[in-house]
């Protein structure tokens, strides 16, 4: 079983949002298949996505075991129809991925405003806590559980009648802001990990929610 005419994978790229993590690569296979291996710096290689014709592999199950570890993956190329042979000594071509540390590098998914409630001149805005596939003691953890106080939310809020956006911040999932009585306001939130120094510090903005629509309620 040779590895003639197989092309090594290239452009290995981690795509990760809220710890859902997929390794992508090129090229689209012609007469070849791929197997992916992943390991921590000090660990053993574990094979995933055996002999796949896809150019991506979901590695979430592996990286959620310890999101603060640094992982390395590699993609092996085999001829199509390849069957594992115990007698084969020739190592198939492979390419290494960049290192990936989920806690530092996973992108923050778009947040959602769960609700807002007005009481007089105060509005309480609640951000939905997203669930992740990270587990502790067989329980799935939320984004807040994983990041704790490292994660903050920035609230942008503005009168429906004006364009200037005021800001508020919280390291919980709740905001309590002052508003003018009788005015309708709109809200959008952004997740931020201030300790990060890279382009993935911030999420995209949540959808805008405005008072006078179904998510909010008002009490005097």
């Amino acid at each position: 079983s040779g590895t003639t005419n197989t092309v090594a994978a290239y452009n290995l790229t981690w795509k990760s949002t809220n710890f859902k993590t997929i390794l992508e690569w090129e090229p689209k296979p012609i007469n070849q298949v791929y197997t992916v291996q992943i390991s921590t710096k000090s660990g053993d290689w574990k094979s995933k996505c055996f002999y796949t014709a896809d150019t991506e592999c979901d590695l979430t199950d592996e990286i959620v075991k310890d999101v603060k570890q640094t992982y390395l993956a590699r993609v092996f190329s085999y001829p199509a129809g390849h069957v594992e042979s115990t007698g084969s000594t020739e190592e198939p071509p492979y390419e290494n991925s960049p290192e990936f540390t989920p806690y530092l590098e996973t992108n923050l998914g778009q947040p959602t405003i769960q609700s807002f409630e007005q009481v007089g001149t105060k509005v309480n805005v609640t951000v939905q806590d997203e669930w992740t596939l990270v587990r502790r003691n067989d329980t799935f953890l939320s984004l807040r559980d994983v990041f704790g106080k490292d994660l903050i939310y920035t609230l942008y809020y503005w009168k429906s009648s004006s364009s200037g956006k005021k800001t508020a911040k919280t390291n919980t999932n709740e905001f309590l802001i002052d508003v003018d009585k009788g005015e309708n306001y709109c809200f959008s939130v952004q997740a931020v990990i201030p300790s990060r120094r890279t382009a993935n510090r911030k999420s995209t903005d949540s959808p805008v929610e405005c008072m006078g629509h179904e998510k909010g309620e008002s009490r005097e």
């Epitope: 903050i152 920035t154 364009s163 005021k166 800001t167 201030p194």
Partner: antibody, heavy 120, light 107 residues
């Protein structure tokens, strides 16, 4: 190294316009918030406004609302302050500053400032 | 808008003196107060953030504290390079606002 460099200041007549630039290096402006702050001669700093370059959101001090506009070009990693209908009381050194969007968000880096003089 | 009332507006002190500057917020600003140092012709420099946290690279003779809406900047032993103007700033709500400044001069 994080750096902010303002440019575009100068002498302008009352009612005139000027555009200031704030060129950032060592970080990506779309990951932060950029503020403009001014300081009149012998006075304390006065906040002018901010932009979040990731979404274009802005807010302005009442003293400049309707006359000043903040924008950003993320491809150039630069923020701008367009100043129209300038008045004598707008004379000041104008600084841009970075807001790290932490819980209490101090301005952790400032430019060196550019002087705007409004006089006939 | 939240007013930040800073006092004194100026003070004279000698090298080695303990110097205290205070700032009072017109309403609750939690711990969202920063202190800056400014020298003539230069931009302000961050010293203290979140009321009491020393910014990276700032000498430990600078400290900050909070009591309700009162905030204090203390220089434990004034050094020649500390003669400058100091400003407090709140960033709890938009717009952020600055105190009027305290000029620390040589006695």
């Amino acid at each position: 190294e994080v750096q902010l460099v303002e440019s575009g200041g100068g002498l302008v007549q009352p009612g005139g316009s000027l555009r200031l630039s704030c060129a950032a290096s060592g970080f990506t402006i779309s990951s932060y918030i950029i503020h403009w702050v001014r300081q009149a001669p012998g006075k304390g700093p006065e906040w002018v406004g901010y932009i979040d370059p990731s979404n274009g959101y802005t807010y302005y001090a009442d003293s400049v609302k309707g006359r000043f506009t903040i924008s950003a070009d993320t491809s150039k990693n630069t923020a701008y302050l367009q100043m129209n209908s300038l008045r004598a009381e707008d004379t000041a050194v104008y600084y841009c500053a970075r807001d790290p969007q932490t819980l209490t968000s101090p301005f952790d880096y400032w430019g060196q400032g550019t002087l705007v003089t409004v006089s006939s | 808008d939240i007013q930040m009332t800073q006092s004194p507006s100026s003070l004279s002190a000698s090298v080695g003196d303990r110097v205290t500057i205070t700032c009072r917020a017109s309403q609750d600003v939690n711990t969202a107060v920063a202190w800056y140092q400014q020298k003539p012709g230069k931009a302000p420099k961050l010293l203290i953030y979140s009321a009491s946290f020393l910014y990276s690279g700032v000498p430990s003779r600078f400290s900050g504290s909070r009591s309700g809406t009162d905030f204090t900047l203390t220089i434990s032993s004034l050094q020649p390079e500390d003669f400058a103007t100091y400003y407090c700033q709140q960033h709890y709500t938009t717009p952020p606002t600055f105190g009027q400044g305290t000029k620390v001069e040589i006695k």
